[in-house]
Interface confidence: low
């Protein structure tokens, strides 16, 4: 899996989207987990509703929310009041039994100074946020991690 970078501004909300094949993952609950170190386990942060039919309902764990558009095939995670310690590598997962398939690897970057990215909105397509109920959510910037880039800095 390639890693997709999502950048957000400290103190604001960041929305992460994980597209998936709605046919293949039909009937499966989803989860958002945080990778603990390069080779470490992925620690569950929040998962979708226990009843798959209610996956569209937003579930919160602290400042992190998850909602699943099972027809369209998009899992959306909202990180509210983004803080520097939220930066790191995460995964969107599809759950089946005791197994979990990785839908997307995500590197969250937290930008300290919003003025440095005041033109970031030019990169966003407003229509993409229309189905979400949080009107205050800030638009995120995402890109794929370039070949050779590493999500974890080398340890000295």
């Amino acid at each position: 899996h390639n890693t997709t970078v999502f950048q957000g501004v400290a103190g604001q909300s960041l929305q992460v989207s994980c597209p998936y094949d709605s046919m293949k993952h039909w009937g499966r609950r989803k989860a958002w987990c945080r990778q603990l170190g390069e080779k470490g386990p992925c620690q569950r942060v929040v998962s979708t509703h226990n009843l798959w039919l209610l996956s569209f309902l937003r579930r919160w764990n602290g400042s992190t929310a998850i909602t699943d558009d099972t027809l369209g095939g998009t899992l959306t995670i909202t990180l509210r009041n983004l803080q520097p310690h939220d930066a790191g590598l995460y995964q969107c997962q599809s759950l089946h039994g005791s197994e979990a398939d990785t839908l997307r690897k995500v590197l969250v970057e937290v930008l300290a100074d919003p003025l440095d990215h005041r033109d970031a909105g030019d990169l966003w397509f407003p229509g993409e946020s229309e189905s979400f109920e949080d009107a205050h959510v800030e638009h995120s910037i995402s890109r794929s991690l370039l070949e050779g880039e590493i999500p974890f800095p080398p340890t000295s």
């Epitope: 798959w52 095939g73 398939d101």
Partner: antibody, heavy 123, light 112 residues
Framework: QVQLVQSGAEVKKPGSSVKVSCKAS????????MNWVRQAPGQGLEWMGR????????NYAQKFQGRVTITADESTSTAYMELSSLRSEDTAVYYC????????????????WGQGTLVTVSS | DVVMTQTPLSLSVTPGQPASISCRSS???????????LHWYLQKPGQSPQLLIY???NRFSGVPDRFSGSGSGTDFTLKISRVEAEDVGVYYC?????????FGQGTKLEIK
């Protein structure tokens, strides 16, 4: 148009293995489940298993677990079904069949079938 | 596994007359997503099976409108309003709500 073309008939000895191929064309091979179904002479249809070529995810019927292996080669859009430890009861026509995909999530019916491959197990 | 039971196992019909095949499953075929994955296939003599009806009542492309499917839960029916000579073959109901997918024993339709 969608086409599934299977390999030719095989005659095998009991205890041996057979590998049947199914070459797909006319659709996105990687993102549709491919099934294998068999039909013994004069009998009904029996589902053996399926594969999602996009990532190799497989499910098998309990009856064939441990004896059947379904694989897929995305580069050639070809699915394979290998059945080992053959016995005379495995004599059948083996079909590959794609799962229907129209609206998102409205799937799980086999809309296109290969022409079938007759496997005869005889000493 | 879900057991699919078809009745009758054979049917002899005069052209132009209706025909009906029943299919019963050993457990409900309603998926957790609300859909019911019950399908009907026809296998004509010497041919591969072909899809007729998917998800209880949806005719597959190219299937004549004389074919219709109905039912819910565990009881389903395939109806042919006016049988034609080309309809001969073996009809199978099948479920894909649960893995492993299973088929009925088949109903052989003959023309009188």
């Amino acid at each position: 148009q969608v086409q599934l073309v299977q390999s030719g008939a095989e005659v095998k000895k009991p205890g041996s293995s057979v590998k049947v191929s199914c070459k797909a064309s006319g659709y996105a091979f990687s993102s549709s489940w491919m099934n294998w179904v068999r039909q013994a002479p004069g009998q009904g249809l029996e589902w053996m298993g399926r594969i999602y070529p996009g990532d190799g995810d497989t499910n098998y019927a309990q009856k064939f677990q441990g004896r059947v292996t379904i694989t897929a080669d995305e580069s050639t859009s070809t699915a394979y079904m290998e059945l080992s430890s053959l016995r005379s009861e495995d004599t059948a026509v083996y079909y590959c069949a794609r799962l229907l995909r129209n609206q998102p999530g409205e799937s799980y019916a086999m809309d296109y079938w290969g022409q079938g491959t007759l496997v005869t197990v005889s000493s | 596994d879900v057991v699919m039971t078809q009745t009758p196992l054979s049917l002899s019909v005069t052209p132009g007359q209706p025909a009906s095949i029943s299919c019963r499953s050993s457990q409900s075929l309603v998926h957790s997503n609300g859909y019911t994955y019950l399908h009907w296939y026809l296998q004509k003599p010497g041919q591969s099976p072909q899809l007729l009806i998917y998800k209880v009542s949806n005719r597959f492309s190219g299937v004549p409108d004389r074919f219709s499917g109905s039912g819910s839960g565990t009881d389903f029916t395939l109806k042919i309003s006016r049988v034609e000579a080309e309809d001969v073959g073996v009809y199978y109901c099948s479920q894909s709500t649960r893995v492993p997918y299973t088929f009925g024993q088949g109903t052989k339709l003959e023309i009188k």
